[in-house]
Interface confidence: low
């Protein structure tokens, strides 16, 4: 039987009446244009909604926007357009919301041609009041807040100037000209690239990388011949042009660019690219594009310094620079990532890793599904997940995979069951154990969201027709109830719930269309009365993550430790609540070879945990660049996986000797760097 239709599904008592009392409609007094929504702060209930409408006139486009504010999670909205003097707000800049609970908001206004600079509206009280500020420049990018201090803002101008404000946008100072890209680092540091000759495009590969740690009083050039740069975790990466040809290589720094090491990654040519797929303070996943327009490349995982890389996955699907990749961090379970590979026959297949890229495998076929026509053997196939690539291809996939750190183990995604992703209409699948096992949750494509840390899952069918029904489940997607939230169906445009999945409110956005007009409308449903009581100790059960073989003493060991979680029982209908904290009990594992990656010059043959010397390097001294000096590596081929906490057990020996020679191949050695002050 279809999910939710078997006899075991108990109905939630009197839910229609309970939800009807907690369903709030708001019709926006707007013609339908575009709508954008932002949450201001965490657990504040404050939502800002910006609606914009363009009227194309013969010579120009006339625009009108309205700003609405809710402070009760979207149940009621107040028109606050007058707070921004009825100004037209530029939607391409969005609403710049300050970090953490700063309550800061910056809106960028449209200004008439010929004006000296742009205009912003600033609020530091969760959008209760706004201050209008005229800028001495025209912004090219959204204002960027320093992660450490929300009073510090940076922006690039249309003239490529780098502008900084130290008082939350009240006063601005141009600290550098000819800037291509700027990013905040840690400790209010700004990194940026500059061009010397014509433009960012013309100087690509000849840019300089600069750093200021005092908001523009002094500068240090930390790299030359730069193509691009990126920040990930504690790593600063730069792709640098080679001296002799048009290839470039990745260099990495862990000290804000003072010293650089060349990453042991393949160099790339003009048409290729590098991409940081994911990074934390321990390590980085790096994609290196294949030569030619293949649409795939190789994933490498780094050591703890970001220098030595192990090949993690071949034929990784990634279409073009800034293009589509399905790489997804499953945030509901440590070490789990999902992505797609392009097989030799051009079909796309989903792969999953449970150990941070150490090993990749196909997703297990869901118990309640049959293999489709892509399967050569209809009894043996896998689940394949639709993500960004499928969405870009306009397949019938309304949403990417979803997981939340506080909804432990839950992953929801569209997929098909076969030998490869199918172009057919997908169904929705759920995993409650971080991707080890899967179940078909809903027939056909849906929008979905997680509420109350996994206590409730809400879904709406993806349809071209107007809708008036929402589905919800209180048992992690096993059984579903349907609730008609309005008599008059609406054209659905999106589901909105507070980021972090702690809320019990969901907003359904859409528009109504009549003969003459169409209007935005939202329905906010509060599920608090469905989950009548707070969860107690008896509602939780102990769950060992990554458990595959309960008989094995090392069962659940991933990256050197195992974790037991307290998880809500599927049968418990209660509130985790806004203050719910994931309870976990870690325990350290003994080290095995699985806890080590292969060192520079070594690789793992397939289905073998031993690291073997690369044939082409056999008998050679292993020399590589570290901080601009050549190092001599004496190793038996192993290096501890970043973030691995194992103790005892096997312990391969490793030693590095300084060769006291300069690296000829390192373009970012310290003596090439210089400082200057304003």
């Amino acid at each position: 039987s279809a999910p939710g239709e078997d006899e075991e599904c108990g109905r939630v008592r009197d839910f229609v009446a309970k939800l009807a009392n907690n369903t709030h409609q708001h019709v926006f007094d707007d013609l339908r244009g575009s709508v954008s929504l932002s949450w201001v702060g965490d657990s504040t209930g404050v939502i800002l909604v910006l609606t914009t409408f363009h009227v194309p006139l013969v010579i120009m486009t006339f625009g009108q926007s309205k700003l609405y504010r809710s402070e009760d999670y979207g149940k009621n909205f107040k028109d606050i357009t007058d707070l921004i003097n009825n100004t037209f707000i530029r939607t391409e800049f969005g609403m710049a919301i300050g970090p953490e609970n700063s309550g800061k908001v910056v809106l960028t206004a449209e200004v008439s041609g010929g004006s000296r600079g742009g205009r912003i509206f600033r609020s530091s009280d969760f959008a209760k009041n706004f201050v209008q500020t005229d800028l001495p420049f025209h912004p090219l990018t959204q204002m960027m807040y320093s992660p450490q201090n929300s009073d510090y803002l940076l922006a690039l101008s249309t003239e490529n100037g780098l502008w900084v404000s130290k008082n939350f946008g009240g006063k601005w100072e141009e600290i550098h000209k000819a800037v291509c890209l700027a990013k905040w680092g840690s400790d209010n540091t700004i990194f940026f690239t500059t061009y010397a000759n014509g433009s960012c495009k013309a100087d690509l590969g000849a840019l300089e990388l600069w750093r200021t740690s005092d908001l523009g009083k002094s500068f240090k050039t930390i790299g030359v011949k730069i193509y691009s740069f990126g920040l990930g975790g504690r790593f600063l990466f730069a792709s640098v042009m080679a001296d002799k040809d048009t290839t470039r290589r990745i260099h990495v720094s862990t000290d804000q660019g003072d010293t650089w090491s060349m990453a042991q990654l393949p160099s790339v040519g003009q048409e290729q690219f590098y991409s940081i797929l994911a990074a934390n303070d321990d390590m980085v996943f790096m994609h290196v594009d294949e030569p030619g327009d293949t649409g795939f490349g190789t994933i490498f995982t780094s050591d703890d310094r970001g220098i030595v890389y192990s090949k993690s996955l071949d034929r990784h699907l990634y279409t073009t620079t800034g293009g589509e990749t399905d790489f997804t961090n499953v945030t509901s379970l440590r070490g789990v990532y999902i992505t797609s590979v392009l097989s030799e026959d051009n079909s796309i297949q989903t792969m999953i890793t449970f150990d941070q890229g150490g090993r990749w495998t196909h997703l297990r076929k869901p118990e309640n599904s049959e293999c489709d026509a892509t399967a050569k053997n209809k009894n043996e196939c896998s689940l394949h997940i639709h993500a960004s690539y499928s969405i870009s291809q306009k397949l019938n996939v309304p949403m990417a995979p979803l997981s939340e750190p506080n909804a432990v183990g839950i992953v929801i995604a569209h997929g098909s069951v076969g030998d490869a992703i199918s172009v057919m209409v997908p169904d929705v699948y759920i995993s409650d154990d971080g991707g080890y096992s899967w179940t078909k949750m809903l027939e056909g494509p849906h929008y979905y969201t997680i509420l109350d840390s996994g206590g409730i899952i809400v879904a709406i069918e993806h349809s071209s027709r107007p809708i008036n029904v929402i589905k919800f489940s209180t048992d992690e997607g096993q059984c579903w109830q349907t609730y008609t939230f309005t008599r008059d169906p609406i054209y659905f445009t999106g589901l909105a719930s507070e980021p972090g999945a702690r809320s019990m409110n969901i907003s359904i956005w859409g528009f109504t269309e009549s003969f003459l007009t169409s209007q935005w409308v939202s329905y906010t449903i509060d599920f608090k009365d469905i989950l009548e009581r707070n969860c107690e100790e008896k509602d939780y059960t102990i769950w060992l993550a990554h458990s595959t073989d309960p008989e094995d003493y090392e069962d659940g060991c991933i990256l050197g430790y195992k974790e037991q979680f307290l998880r809500l029982r599927k049968s418990s209908v209660c509130q985790n609540g806004r203050d719910y904290v994931v309870t976990k009990q870690p325990s350290i594992c003994l080290c095995s070879l699985e806890d080590f990656l292969c060192d520079f010059g070594y690789y793992r043959p397939e289905n073998d945990s031993k690291c073997v010397e690369q044939p082409e390097l056999k008998g050679h001294d292993l020399e590589f660049c570290l901080y601009g000096r050549e190092e001599h590596l004496t190793t038996n081929g192993y290096r501890k996986i970043p973030g691995d906490k194992c103790q005892g057990g096997v312990n391969p020996v490793r030693e590095v000797k300084d060769l006291k020679k300069k690296c000829t191949s390192n373009f970012l050695s310290p003596e090439k760097q210089n400082s200057k002050s304003n």
Epitope: T294, G295, D345, N346, D372, A373, Y389, I421, V425, D427
Partner: antibody, heavy 129, light 107 residues
């Protein structure tokens, strides 16, 4: 040999429904998708939709959405196409065609499309009052 | 949906001559294109798939080329049995769509 045999000609009144069958033989029925294509008198070919023989999920062209239903019976290796609320413009020859489109899904260079390689003989449906 | 446009609508060619048929897509279909031949009273027959690969049993005089939005079907030396209507069809994005057809007739 591989063949698709369709049911015989039908004459229907406007507003009625018609159900055309297509029996596959000579290959593993569940390995290939099946498309339905129609051709009005003196006109070109028009794709109606596609059905996955395993699971039975179908995808229809927008034009026929709500009026067409494609089903299959794996025990007899037969697919069916039912078109409801018939009107005179539905007078056409209806073909089923084996369509391996699901075998290789969309790659960056494009899914490698194998084409509709086996066709039924066609079923003439006449809608007339 | 992707619109497929074939030209010319009718092509008059003498036996033994070369025939070149064009098919244009309203957006890129990569190489997800097939060509079919249809004779009066018969079902269509697959000639070319993947834009350029001949289907089983199709004579070498039929060849397909192109990628993206522009495609060509070439019949190098027309035989009497080749006079028919030819259709192109894309399968890049649903719904699959056909061109309007090119009728190849005897000059």
């Amino acid at each position: 040999q591989v063949q698709l045999v369709q049911s015989g000609a039908e004459v229907k009144k406007p507003g009625a429904s018609v159900k055309v069958s297509c029996k596959a033989s000579g290959y593993t029925f569940t390995k290939y998708y099946m498309s339905w294509v129609r051709q009005a008198p003196g006109q070109g070919l028009e794709w109606m939709g596609i059905i996955n023989p395993i699971g039975g999920s179908a995808s229809y062209a927008q034009k026929f959405q709500g009026r067409v239903t494609m089903t299959r019976d794996t025990s007899t290796s037969t697919v069916y196409m039912e078109l409801s609320s018939l009107r005179s413009e539905d007078t056409a020859v209806y073909y089923c065609a084996r369509d391996p489109s699901g075998i290789a899904a969309a790659g960056p260079a494009g899914r490698y499309y194998y084409g509709m390689d086996v066709w039924g003989q066609g079923t003439t449906v006449t809608v007339s009052s | 949906e992707i619109v497929m446009t074939q030209s010319p609508a009718t092509l008059s060619v003498s036996p033994g001559e070369r025939a070149t048929l064009s098919c244009r897509a309203s957006q890129s279909v990569s190489s997800n294109l097939a060509w079919y031949q249809q004779k009066p009273g018969q079902a269509p027959r697959l000639l070319i798939y993947g834009a350029s690969t001949r289907a089983t049993g199709i004579p070498a005089r039929f060849s397909g080329s192109g990628s993206g939005t522009e495609f060509t079907l070439t019949i190098s030396s027309l035989q009497s049995e080749d006079f028919a209507v030819y259709y192109c069809q894309q399968a890049r994005l649903g719904p699959w769509t056909f061109g309007g057809g090119t009728k190849v007739e005897i000059k």
